[in-house]
Interface confidence: low
């Protein structure tokens, strides 16, 4: 079989299977139109020359008027595919060149087809990822916000129950304060009692104050950190970033959890051991009710 | 060194009155707390009350507040707790304790008998 | 009132064994983070020793073979490796809420 033939054959298989590619089809008529014109008018300029050597020379014409017209005229594809079709019957050096480059269009098409099948296989989990994240993110968030209902309900308990604890306290301490004015009618004790009484009033309002602002503190620093998530406006690419920033951004955060909770623990252990060191003193500066208030930490 | 030093053992006949101290050393007196604990024979503890030795002030557990009364001598650093119309519920033995129940006396221990 | 509730009311644990009480509370005994549940060790005809404070700390002194943990109602005192000397009775007692409470105590013996 020759050189000739071979292409012949392989053409033809080439034909059937780019027949079975139809979104292509249109543009590769376009082109085998143009590849057409050209290699007629290579031809007959071939056959018109009397030497051999003018025959090669024309043949390099050829050539160029082939190639030429396909660089300028060229429509752009309308597809990921690339010109694949070589000429009908090349002769001599033309089907080693063409054999070559049709082999390697061949090869780059394949290529770039698995490259867009794992572009998309990426994509599509990476969407999915993405579902899952802003999901996890939901969900944690609600259950932060129960949580903190939660705690406040128990707190607007808590300081209930030492209202109420520490009105009646108040009140024994009262009671007893007219049975020891009346058993010992003295003015000057009256009057220590009474400012001792002011004093702590003044003290209890002086921390409720302090407490007040370190909450203001607290509240304004959580909602510095609370950023807004936009993302409507952004492209794959720039989701794809926003997630593995967000992811980053959720390591981090955990990270610093971890490492406050150390950290917590630590000095609560040194402020329990203060705190049940000077418990008790604190409790003697202060009426009881008030000193179970003032007497622990925010 | 903080110690609290307690009265002697206590034989008193029911429907009496009995006052046990409790005296302080090693601290400052104005500073903490004087709690008092009973425990009855081969039982629990129980939580009486709290004293400021600084001014007086008390709180009772309420089952005792009708049994027993707390006191304070600055003068003396002493803690004082009486405990009146006496039945046979209440032998046990009391103690003083301070500081958030860290610093404990040795204990009193009453007997009520005919 | 709070009530604490102790158990075993009694265990025998052998020399070099883990010895491990529970207490539980009628209602949270936590505050902000930290639960203000104590343990205490009495031995016969000696007042009560305070061992841990707010739930977990061990009290200076106290040999680090006692270990407490939990927090809001459910409570444990460990003892690993229990210790010929340990054999006495214990007692939880929260310091949150007026009245303070004791448990009713557990009473340890070494086999």
């Known amino acids: 079989m020759s050189d000739i033939e071979e292409v012949v054959e392989e053409y033809e298989e080439e034909e059937q299977e780019e027949a079975a590619v139809e979104e292509e089809e249109d543009w590769r008529e376009d082109e085998d139109e143009q590849e057409e014109a050209a290699e007629e008018d290579a031809e007959a300029e071939a056959e018109t020359e009397e030497t051999r050597a003018e025959e090669d020379e024309e043949e390099e014409e050829a050539k160029e008027a082939e190639d030429g017209p396909m660089e300028e005229s060229k429509p752009k594809p309308r597809s990921f595919m690339p010109n694949l079709v070589p000429p009908k019957i090349p002769d001599g050096e033309r089907v080693d060149f063409d054999d070559i480059h049709r082999k390697r269009m061949e090869k780059d098409l394949n290529e770039l087809q698995a490259l867009i099948e794992a572009h998309f296989e990426n994509r599509k989990k990476e969407e999915e990822e993405l579902v899952s994240l802003k999901d996890r993110i939901e969900r944690r968030r609600a259950e932060r916000a129960e949580q903190q209902r939660i705690r406040n309900e128990r707190e607007k308990e808590r300081q209930n129950r030492l209202a109420e604890e520490r009105a009646r306290r108040e009140e024994e301490e009262n009671r007893r304060k007219a049975e020891d004015e009346a058993r010992k009618k003295k003015a000057l004790s009256n009057m220590m009692h009474f400012g001792g009484y002011i004093q702590k009033q003044a003290q209890t309002e002086r921390k409720s104050g302090k407490r007040q602002t370190e909450r203001e503190k607290k509240k304004k620093i959580l909602a510095e950190r609370r950023k807004v998530l936009a993302i409507d406006h952004l492209n794959e690419d720039q989701l794809r970033e926003k997630a593995k920033e967000l992811w980053q951004s959720i390591y981090n955060l955990e990270a610093e959890k971890f490492d406050l909770q150390e950290k917590f623990k630590q000095q609560k252990y040194e402020i329990n051991v203060l705190r049940n060191r000077i418990n008790d003193n604190q409790k003697v500066s202060k009426t009881r009710g008030k000193a179970k208030v003032t007497g622990r930490w925010k | 060194e903080v110690q609290l030093q307690q009265s002697g053992p206590e034989l008193v006949k029911p429907g009496a009155s009995v006052k046990m101290s409790c005296k302080a050393s090693?601290?400052?007196?104005?500073?903490?707390?004087m709690k008092w604990v009973k425990q009855s024979h081969g039982k629990s503890l129980e939580w009486i009350g709290d004293?400021?030795?600084?001014?007086?002030?008390?709180f009772y557990n309420q089952k005792f507040k009708d049994k027993a009364t707390l006191t304070v001598d600055k003068s003396s650093s002493t803690a004082y707790m009486q405990l009146n119309s006496l039945t046979s519920e209440d032998s046990a033995v009391y103690y003083c304790?301070?500081?958030?129940?860290?610093?404990w006396g040795q204990g009193t221990t009453l007997t009520v008998s005919s | 009132d709070i009530v604490l509730t102790q158990s075993p009311a009694s265990l025998a644990v052998s020399l070099g064994q883990r010895a491990t009480i529970s207490c539980k509370a009628s209602?949270?005994?936590?505050?902000?983070?930290?639960?203000?549940m104590n343990w205490f060790q009495q031995k016969a005809g000696q007042p009560p020793k305070r061992l841990i404070y707010?739930?977990?700390n061990l009290e200076s002194g106290i040999p680090a073979r006692f270990s407490g943990r939990g927090s809001g109602t459910d409570f444990a005192l460990n003892i690993h490796p229990v210790e010929e000397e340990d054999a006495a009775t214990y007692y939880c007692?929260?310091?949150?809420?007026?009245?303070?409470?004791f448990g009713g105590g557990t009473k340890l013996e070494i086999k």
């Open positions: 304790a301070t500081r958030v129940f860290d610093y």
């Open positions: 090693g601290y400052t007196f104005t500073d903490y707390y």
């Open positions: 004293i400021n030795p600084n001014n007086g002030e008390t």
């Open positions: 209602q949270s005994v936590d505050y902000d983070g930290t639960s203000y």
């Open positions: 707010a739930a977990s």
């Open positions: 007692q929260q310091s949150n809420e007026d009245p303070y409470t």
